[in-house]
């Protein structure tokens, strides 16, 4: 009786089970009662990453420098090229088809997590006792200066955007 289902790494065609082509190879011709499935390796800059019956290999992804992309991992006959973004940029999606400039954290905000090639900068508001007076993609919130440790007193209170201003203590005259 002709099979109705086939084993793993096989496919059903013309009432018989044929072997799938291994990753990195494409289908040239289906098996017959006399021959096995004929497969051919993918060409340069092509890949197939699964056991398959594809008649064409997929083209490797092109990391377009005009879109801020560069190659993170070169593709093989079994894997696609992995793109990432140039320094200072990050991917707009998981597929990393284009890049955008890393976001900077405005004054009053500090960097909680520095951006990578695939994720943007994460900013956080500077809490009480901390400030940031610059727009930066790297700077964290800095703690206010401790006037006391310098034997000074606070002359002007700090904010989330400014440091405290320290000054000398008023001395009582004799």
């Amino acid at each position: 009786e002709p099979p109705t289902a086939c084993r793993e790494k096989q496919y059903l065609i013309n009432s018989q089970c044929c072997s799938l082509c291994q990753p990195g190879q494409k289908l040239v011709s289906d098996c017959t009662e006399f021959t096995e499935t004929e497969c051919l390796p993918c060409g340069e800059s092509e890949f197939l990453d699964t056991w398959n019956r594809e008649t064409h290999c997929h083209q490797h992804k092109y990391c377009d420098p005009n879109l801020g992309l560069r190659v993170q991992q070169k593709g093989t006959s079994e894997t696609d090229t992995i793109c990432t973004c140039e320094e200072g940029w990050h991917c707009t999606s998981e597929a990393c088809e284009s890049c955008v400039l890393h976001r900077s954290c405005s004054p009053g905000f500090g960097v909680k997590q520095i951006a990578t090639g695939v994720s943007d900068t994460i900013c956080e508001p500077c809490p009480v006792g901390f400030f940031s007076n610059v727009s930066s993609a790297f700077e964290k919130c800095h703690p206010w200066t401790s006037c006391e440790t310098k034997d000074l007193v606070v002359q002007q209170a700090g904010t989330n955007k400014t440091d405290v201003v320290c000054g000398p203590q008023d001395r009582l005259r004799a």
Partner: antibody, heavy 117, light 107 residues
Framework: EVKLVESGGGLVKPGASLKLSCAAS????????MSWVRQNSDKRLEWVAS????????YYPDNVKGRCTISRENAKNTLYLEMSSLKTEDTALYYC??????????WGQGTSVTVST | DIVLTQSPATLSVIPGNSVSLSCRAS??????LHWYQQKSHESPRLLIN???QSISGIPSRFSGSGSGTDFTLTINSVETEDFGIYFC?????????FGGGTKLELK
């Protein structure tokens, strides 16, 4: 018991035609692909033709394409090989074989074809 | 066409000894290779399929190995009934092709 019995061989002149037959028994003939393979005096084996179980698909090497026709009559459990424009290099022992698991799992005893002036 | 080259052409052996017969393909055929044995005045018979799979009714002293382009048929402790010609055959692609054979003879 699987049995394949070839017949129809003989001595013919170059350019002549010949039809070989293979009577199959001991298995469900219509479930199997069949092939013809020949062996010359040097004992070299050469594939000549194959036909699918249903008879829809036929396969030939380039050197016999157009000169050989493989066919089958499933109702009669019989395989055929019709050869025309015979050449001296077609001289050989012709075997009928069954295709099982993509191998030639059973062979007949062969029928001799001699092409000579 | 895929060319199969068998070596040696002739192999002389003393019964009881083990032998290895080689079959080399002109391009990769994965494991799509069969081995056949032909004794004197007999038809060929299937010994091994898919390069290494044993066939029911064939003595266990016959074994096959290899993949890609290099294949080996090993006969452990040759018996007198093993003398004859051994052929490899590829079924990776059309046309089906056979090796030229290795003749195993008594030393």
């Amino acid at each position: 018991e699987v049995k394949l019995v070839e017949s129809g061989g003989g001595l013919v002149k170059p350019g002549a035609s010949l039809k070989l037959s293979c009577a199959a028994s001991g298995f469900t003939f219509s479930n199997y692909g069949m092939s013809w393979v020949r062996q010359n005096s040097d004992k070299r084996l050469e594939w000549v033709a194959s036909i699918s179980s249903g008879g829809d698909d036929t396969y030939y090497p380039d050197n016999v394409k157009g000169r050989c026709t493989i066919s089958r009559e499933n109702a009669k459990n019989t395989l055929y090989l019709e050869m025309s424009s015979l050449k001296t290099e077609d001289t050989a022992l012709y075997y009928c074989t069954r295709a099982g698991g993509k191998a030639m799992d059973y062979w007949g005893q062969g029928t001799s074809v001699t092409v000579s002036t | 066409d895929i060319v199969l080259t068998q070596s040696p052409a002739t192999l002389s052996v003393i019964p009881g000894n083990s032998v290895s017969l080689s079959c080399r393909a002109s391009q990769s055929i994965r494991d799509n290779l069969h081995w056949y044995q032909q004794k004197s005045h007999e038809s060929p018979r299937l010994l091994i399929n898919y390069a290494s799979q044993s066939i029911s009714g064939i003595p266990s002293r016959f074994s096959g190995s290899g993949s890609g382009t290099d294949f080996t048929l090993t006969i452990n402790s040759v018996e007198t009934e093993d003398f004859g010609i051994y052929f490899c055959q590829q079924f990776n692609s059309w046309p089906l092709t056979f090796g030229g054979g290795t003749k195993l003879e008594l030393k």
